[in-house]
């Protein structure tokens, strides 16, 4: 009879990770008598997979039933494969002896290679906000890929962006991969409800794309443009000063009256109106009795936004002219601030 | 199902001869190593020989020179020929396959009596 | 010869009693060893081989464990069908050998 050869038909196997793997093996001869073995690896290192003679092996079960001594059928199939598992297979006859078994033949071996899913796509932005014009960085990282080929986009609004770096790791051979790309996003102040997205396409995805998003109404600040009118009110001896807090983003601001630079009033945002671009308008107001006052008031809305340095603007209340003559006759949304008399 | 059926067993002068037959059936004889078991009444077990699929053949000391055992796939027979038989060769044989992968004994015929003596 | 040496030679128990049958070599046998159950008049039947597979058909109250040259054959649960003899036998090595015996009897 001819001497036992030990048949792997397959060169390499492609698995999905999840699944299960499929290791074909087979003898061409029941002689000799001895034990089957899978090796993950070749030489003393090897890894071992499954033994017929002895062993728990919960992930592994055989093709056929290898108890019988008329079986030259040695596959095994590995159930849950993770990206951990990929590697040359070999499958090993022993022949029985004494005192250990020796190892008589081995396969050519089958490569396993596990297709591995990205994981969602996670953007992050800047730790702290920044203003219009100004640049941010966005990062985009994926783990746990197989095989390393990708590809990643990014994209502002649908539109595709082309300033950004990414990286594969690591650069050698690897059971799993992860990238890690960096994009740079110039801000504008209409970039409140914009959204930057970070694609990844991966051969496991079968052309669905994974995403990953940020919203830029975490990143930019949009600081306040104000303004401050005066108009007459019903009473011939009392001005309506009003500060119009606009375009401002986001809400978290404080605004403080100062009459001749003593505090007159603070108060918080609170019934904003928002606009179009999601950023925010806030009106307050002040009635002044400009009887009280023998000298010219100068009146100062100063307004602290997202914690940053306060920014404010003047409007100075000649009290020596009739009040229907001062400032602009601009009619302004009343938003419901408390009235202040100035005595 | 695996059967294992022996027969051929009796009385037998010492010095005499006798040939056990093994008939096999439920299984593909030819990929199967099979053995010969004895037992004298009353005591254990004694391995008394075993061929291999290659048709290789193993005896221990006790009956080696004495005992051939052979085997015709396309019969699916297996055979023990006893020559210059003993006293002491008085027992039940039995025919077993050897059914495991590592050649572990895994089905027994009923046995035939084989007794020697005068 | 490798010699096989079972312990107790015989052993009264009792219905649902767990009992342990020990099996000795004379040198290491590297596992290839199996357990047989025979009752009178009977063939031998195979219990457990390469020292703790169980054998097909075989309910799981029958336990084989041990390596090198001590092995061990446990019986969980005694049921009155499991009285019987049993052998230890050695295949690793022609000329194959088994054991004397146990004779397992109800007390």
């Known amino acids: 009879e001819e001497e036992l050869q030990v048949i792997q038909p397959d060169k390499s196997v492609l698995v999905a990770a999840g699944e299960t793997a499929t290791l074909r093996c087979t003898a061409t001869s029941l002689i000799p008598v001895g034990p089957i073995q899978w090796f993950r690896g070749a030489g003393p290192g090897r890894e071992l997979i499954y033994n017929q003679k002895e062993g728990h092996f919960p992930r592994v079960t055989t093709v056929s039933d290898l108890t019988k001594r008329n079986n030259m059928d040695f596959s095994i199939r590995i159930g849950n494969i993770t990206p951990a598992d990929a590697g040359t297979y070999y499958c090993v006859k022993f022949r029985k002896g004494s005192p250990d078994d020796v190892e008589f033949k081995s396969g050519a071996g089958t490569e396993l290679s596990v297709r591995a899913k990205p994981s969602a796509p996670v953007v992050s932005g800047p730790a702290a906000r920044a203003t219009p014009q100004h640049t941010v960085s966005f990062t985009c990282e994926s783990h746990g890929f197989s095989p390393r080929d990708i590809t990643l986009k990014w994209f502002k609004n649908g539109n595709e962006l082309s300033d950004f770096q990414t990286n594969v790791d690591p650069v050698g051979e690897s059971v799993s991969y992860s990238i890690h790309s960096t994009a740079k996003v110039v801000l504008t102040r209409e970039d409140v409800h914009s959204q930057v997205i970070c694609e990844v396409a991966h051969v496991t995805l079968q052309g669905d794309p994974l995403r990953g998003t940020a919203n830029l109404s975490e990143t930019i600040r949009v600081p306040p443009t104000l303004e401050v009118t005066q108009q007459p009110v019903r009473a011939e001896n009392q001005v309506n000063v009003t500060c119009q807090v606009r375009k401002f983003y986001p809400q978290r601001l404080q605004l403080t009256w100062l009459e001749n630079g003593n505090v007159s009033r603070t108060e918080t945002a609170s019934t904003v109106t928002e606009n179009k671009d999601g950023t925010y308008n806030w009106m307050s107001w002040l009635l002044v009795n400009v009887s009280a006052h023998r000298d010219d008031v100068k009146l100062t809305c100063q307004v602290e936004h997202d914690g940053q340095p306060a920014v404010s603007k003047s409007h100075d209340l000649k009290v020596s002219a009739h009040p229907k003559e001062q400032g602009s006759n601009t009619a302004a949304e009343n938003t419901g601030s408390n009235e202040r008399n100035i005595y | 199902e695996v059967q294992l059926v022996e027969s051929g067993g009796g009385l037998v002068q010492p010095g005499g001869s006798l040939r056990l037959s093994c008939a096999a059936s439920?299984?593909?004889?030819?990929?199967?190593?099979m053995d010969w078991v004895r037992q004298a009444t009353g005591k254990g077990l004694e391995w008394v020989s075993g061929?291999?699929?290659?048709?290789?053949?193993y005896y221990p000391d006790s009956v080696k020179g004495r005992f051939t055992i052979s085997r015709e796939n396309a019969k699916n027979s297996l055979y023990l020929q006893m020559n210059s038989l003993r006293p002491g060769d008085t027992a039940v044989y039995y025919c077993?396959?050897?059914?495991?992968?590592?050649?572990?004994?895994?089905?027994w015929g009923q046995g035939t009596l084989v007794t020697v003596s005068s | 010869d490798i010699q096989m040496t079972q312990s107790p030679s015989s052993l009264s128990a009792s219905v649902g009693d767990r009992v342990t049958i020990t099996c000795r070599a004379s040198?290491?046998?590297?596992?290839?060893l199996a357990w047989f159950q025979q009752k009178p008049g009977r063939a031998p039947k195979s219990l457990i081989y390469?020292?703790?597979r169980l054998q097909s058909g075989v309910p799981s109250k029958f336990s084989g464990s041990g390596s090198g040259t001590d092995f061990t054959l446990t019986i969980s649960s005694l049921q009155p069908e499991d009285f019987a003899t049993y052998y230890c036998?050695?295949?690793?090595?022609?000329?194959?050998?088994f054991g004397q015996g146990t004779r397992l009897e109800i007390k």
């Open positions: 390469t020292a703790s």
């Open positions: 061929i291999g699929i290659a048709g290789d053949t």
């Open positions: 077993a396959r050897g059914g495991g992968w590592d050649g572990s004994l895994d089905y």
């Open positions: 036998q050695q295949y690793n090595t022609y000329p194959y050998t």
């Open positions: 040198q290491d046998i590297n596992n290839y």
């Open positions: 439920g299984f593909t004889f030819r990929s199967y190593d």
